[in-house]
């Protein structure tokens, strides 16, 4: 038997992936566990094997179909169970009725690129990945720029309160190396959270033109 506190948290990427983390104090690392998904109005079931990510937590991804296929809707409920092998049988460790569109976490934005760079400004664009068409334009973004000598945690957050897949960074220092990241969040869902940060995009501002003597 396993004692201690347990937590089972899952997010839907809005298309065909449910990612889950199960944590259990005092659980054995070598225990074989899985997540089982049982939708209330679909003919499919899905299972993934929980793999350790730390001393007392395990994670897995339920792949529901092709990455851009719309496998669930706002009316779906998926019963999710954590099952761990105990001898010859499987024991249910955790259970929840999961409402996918109340628990959204999108994939990190992709395809970041510098559209135009000058001495003091830089225009950057990106794309969202595997995001449901249900959202239409109901998305928001956060962006941050890493300046020399600073950490990502110190970088001020820039908020884009609409579906805008570009930004113009201003008041930059000439001939300076920067890095840029962006993340996305749907407006829908009580437990919805920000996507992971995108891969950093490195860019350098142009040097200032040499001034002429007057």
């Amino acid at each position: 038997a396993v004692n201690g506190t347990s937590q089972f948290t899952c997010f839907y990427n809005s298309r065909a992936n449910i990612s889950c983390v199960w944590s259990q104090d005092g659980a054995l690392q070598d225990t074989s566990c899985q997540v089982h998904a049982w939708p209330d109005r679909r003919r499919w079931n899905q299972t993934c094997e929980l793999l350790p990510v730390s001393q007392a937590s395990w994670a897995c991804n339920l792949i529901l179909g092709a990455p851009d296929s719309q496998k669930l809707t706002t009316v779906d409920i998926v019963t999710l169970r954590v099952l761990c092998r105990e001898g010859v049988r499987w024991r249910v460790m955790a259970i929840q009725d999961f409402k996918p569109f109340e628990n959204l976490r999108l994939m990190a934005p992709i395809s970041l690129q510098v559209v135009h760079v000058e001495t003091h400004r830089c225009n950057i664009s990106w794309e969202i990945s595997q995001a449901s068409h249900y959202f239409e334009r109901h998305l928001e973004f956060e962006a941050r720029t890493l300046s020399p000598g600073h950490t990502w945690e110190e970088a001020p957050l820039l908020t884009l309160k609409q579906k805008q897949e570009w930004i113009c960074l201003e008041t930059l220092t000439p001939d300076t190396q920067y890095e840029f990241q962006v993340r996305v969040k749907p407006l829908q869902g009580e437990f919805t959270t920000w996507s992971p940060w995108s891969q950093p995009l490195a860019f350098r501002t142009k040097p200032a033109a040499l001034g002429k003597d007057t």
Partner: nanobody, 126 residues
Framework: QLQLVESGGGLVQTGTSLRLSCAAS????????MGWFRQFPGKEREFVAA????????VYVDSVKGRFTISRDNAKSTVYLQMNSLKPEDTAVYYC???????????????????WGQGTQVTVSS
């Protein structure tokens, strides 16, 4: 270990009431949801009702909604099933069950429950 002992079954007339009780002993602090299943002769056990750890959530099979009520008294480590307007088709062996699984669902299955009582016979005569 955890033990569950049912009581309150018996033979009753159609339209009357019966209250089943289930007392838990042993490691009762591990219990989360508790519930009742029933088994008709030659059939699989079927879910009847369940109640969450704090009693705030309950769920019933459609055939007993409005007639049966599940409740629990955590201080006494006991769960109850109040059965009103009984019908001959309610005749079955009723099993108390408990789980230490964390969380809640409205779609309980037999495999969700790791602890079972011995069962108590309920017979409804017409």
């Amino acid at each position: 270990q955890l033990q569950l002992v049912e009581s309150g079954g018996g033979l009753v007339q159609t339209g009357t009431s019966l209250r089943l009780s289930c007392a838990a002993s042993g490691h009762t602090s591990r219990i989360n949801a508790m519930g009742w299943f029933r088994q008709f002769p030659g059939k699989e056990r079927e879910f009847v009702a369940a109640i969450s750890r704090n009693g705030g959530s309950t769920v019933y099979v459609d055939s007993v909604k409005g007639r049966f009520t599940i409740s629990r008294d955590n201080a006494k480590s006991t769960v109850y099933l109040q059965m009103n307007s009984l019908k001959p088709e309610d005749t079955a062996v009723y099993y108390c069950t408990a789980t230490d699984a964390v969380g809640w669902t409205t779609r309980w299955m037999t495999a969700d429950f790791g602890f079972w009582g011995q069962g108590t016979q309920v017979t409804v005569s017409s």
